[in-house]
Interface confidence: low
Amino acid sequence: EAYKSEIAHRYNDLGEEHFRGLVLVAFSQYLQQCPFEDHVKLAKEVTEFAKACAAEESGANCDKSLHTLFGDKLCTVASLRDKYGDMADCCEKQEPDRNECFLAHKDDNPGFPPLVAPEPDALCAAFQDNEQLFLGKYLYEIARRHPYFYAPELLYYAQQYKGVFAECCQAADKAACLGPKIEALREKVLLSSAKERFKCASLQKFGDRAFKAWSVARLSQRFPKADFAEISKVVTDLTKVHKECCHGDLLECADDRADLAKYMCENQDSISTKLKECCDKPVLEKSQCLAEVERDELPGDLPSLAADFVEDKEVCKNYQEAKDVFLGTFLYEYARRHPEYSVSLLLRLAKEYEATLEKCCATDDPPTCYAKVLDEFKPLVDEPQNLVKTNCELFEKLGEYGFQNALLVRYTKKAPQVSTPTLVEVSRKLGKVGTKCCKKPESERMSCAEDFLSVVLNRLCVLHEKTPVSERVTKCCSESLVNRRPCFSGLEVDETYVPKEFNAETFTFHADLCTLPEAEKQVKKQTALVELLKHKPKATDEQLKTVMGDFGAFVEKCCAAENKEGCFSEEGPKLVAAAQAALV
């Protein structure tokens, strides 16, 4: 159905509150440096305009596209040239180039300081004083730090955030109530951001086909009772939703996501028996619930895969007549039977199956050629299984911090050219896979670990793309989405690396280290470890262990000293000299 006014259509569908929130998120994701007040003003003006168009669709400018309206609004920002430099040139372009230009300027690493919560009393006062402004500030702060955050999901988290304050600001001990709840929400938000960034990268770098394949595998595992046509329909709609959000079309994205939730609830009988309680919730919670819903039970009477994909005489005919549909069916059938496999592994198996058919269907005797195809999957399955087993054993032995350090050493040796903050950030996140997945039952470990690693390695790829310094990282990131993790796992020590010159400043520490929270203290130590490795890449694990042990003792000693700063300035150079001698 064609609407006279696109903006009125979205305003009517979404309602004023969600509309205003999404506009605020969109502007904050595009103009990440602008102050909150400027964005509130822009969002208010756009919402007022949309409301006027909803009242009178043939009003002036109401027929303009959303990109035109939003772009025109962004280009009115006076400080655009000063704050964003090149980005101001976007305003000289016509749509759709102008929007593409804004998208290309999104900064995945804007370098804002981490959000530090003020005192609970001050927070509660601000919350009670102006709830709408308080939640708007939350949307703004998350959106500008995460320019690809899945906008409808961010509205959901803002609602959760509101719930936490509504509850805890009534509590006797506000801090005790807020602390753990805010921290738990923060973890969820960070994971959500990384997952959506991975989806956007899949779409932007590898195209719709890659994203659809990923979604077919994931949804087939989750809804094994649904038939392939139903999975395909949901995947097609889901692809549209994520393409819109990744492309900055947040109003369309949120609207289409609500429509998809409605469709799934109206057709739950043919999708999954687990959707019932999600479908009774309001729209934001409903969509979130559906996205997180537990896996349905497998149907009991699934025939062997071999019948359709190996033994059937028509395999090559079926493949050649409709390659993507046939391969999609294979992926669907394999995934629904193997909920314990990671999505990445399932996609590798489908790729292997495709390569086998390409080769065999061109021979004189295809059935003989592909007869053992399913047996040939074994090494592909064994590789992630062994990797998870080995790394979980290491995690259990070392604990999270020790495991992170082991990964830091591993990844710094693989790609020493990568910036130290990136190596520290990525290795710390990779290390969290242990905490997140190793305690799970065997049947869930691989899926948890490998799919989480894919998301974290995507962060490395995104950061590296901004300033490419390592050919091998570029290669692993760009050659194949499903083989990224095996590619990184397979990287050996970079023998071509020329050690970094020693810089005493890098290893100079001060008393302020003592007052840092534990996590930040760890980051400082891990930064020193990376720098040490960049200076002495041939250092053995044993040597590094000794040096890091000495470093920990040095920090502990100086933080306990009467004159902390004096201790750091006196003992620090001795430690550095000893470390250099130990690492010769």
């Epitope: 090149d86 593409e100 998208l103 290309a104 901004k466």
Partner: nanobody
């Protein structure tokens, strides 16, 4: 490492046209932001036109807008500059420059480009 090699320069009359090519090796051209700069005798390097990495967003200096067109052929790993309605003041050595990493937007600042070709001379004179 990116190697760039320009060609297509020469002598042309005012109002005439030329097409410059820049062949890249060592990295795919669509993975880098690339630009044309020029340097007239006794002057500094001046941005002419650029195209973003991973996205075909083009930029032009005001002095060439509407006359010059930048494009690339990913299959040939080559960047082009189609120059029409040439004027005597377009006389210069034209350089192709690359700034790896996508989706980077081209910049008009020469210092931000680590890789340069050796240049090709364009002379506009009657």
């Amino acid at each position: 490492e990116v190697q760039l090699l320009e060609s297509g320069g020469g002598l042309v009359q005012p109002g005439g046209s030329l097409r410059l090519s820049c062949a890249a090796s060592g990295r795919y051209i669509d993975e880098t932001a690339v630009a044309w700069f020029r340097q007239a005798p006794g002057k500094g390097r001046e941005f002419v036109a650029g195209i973003g990495g991973g996205v075909d967003i083009t930029y032009y200096a005001d002095s060439v807008k509407g006359r010059f067109t930048i494009s690339r052929d990913n299959s040939k790993n080559t960047l082009y500059l189609q120059m029409n309605s040439l004027r005597p003041e377009d006389t210069a050595v034209y350089y192709c420059a690359a700034r790896p990493g996508r989706p980077l937007i081209t910049s008009k600042v020469a210092d931000l480009y680590p890789y340069w070709g050796q240049g090709t001379l364009v002379t506009v004179s009657s």
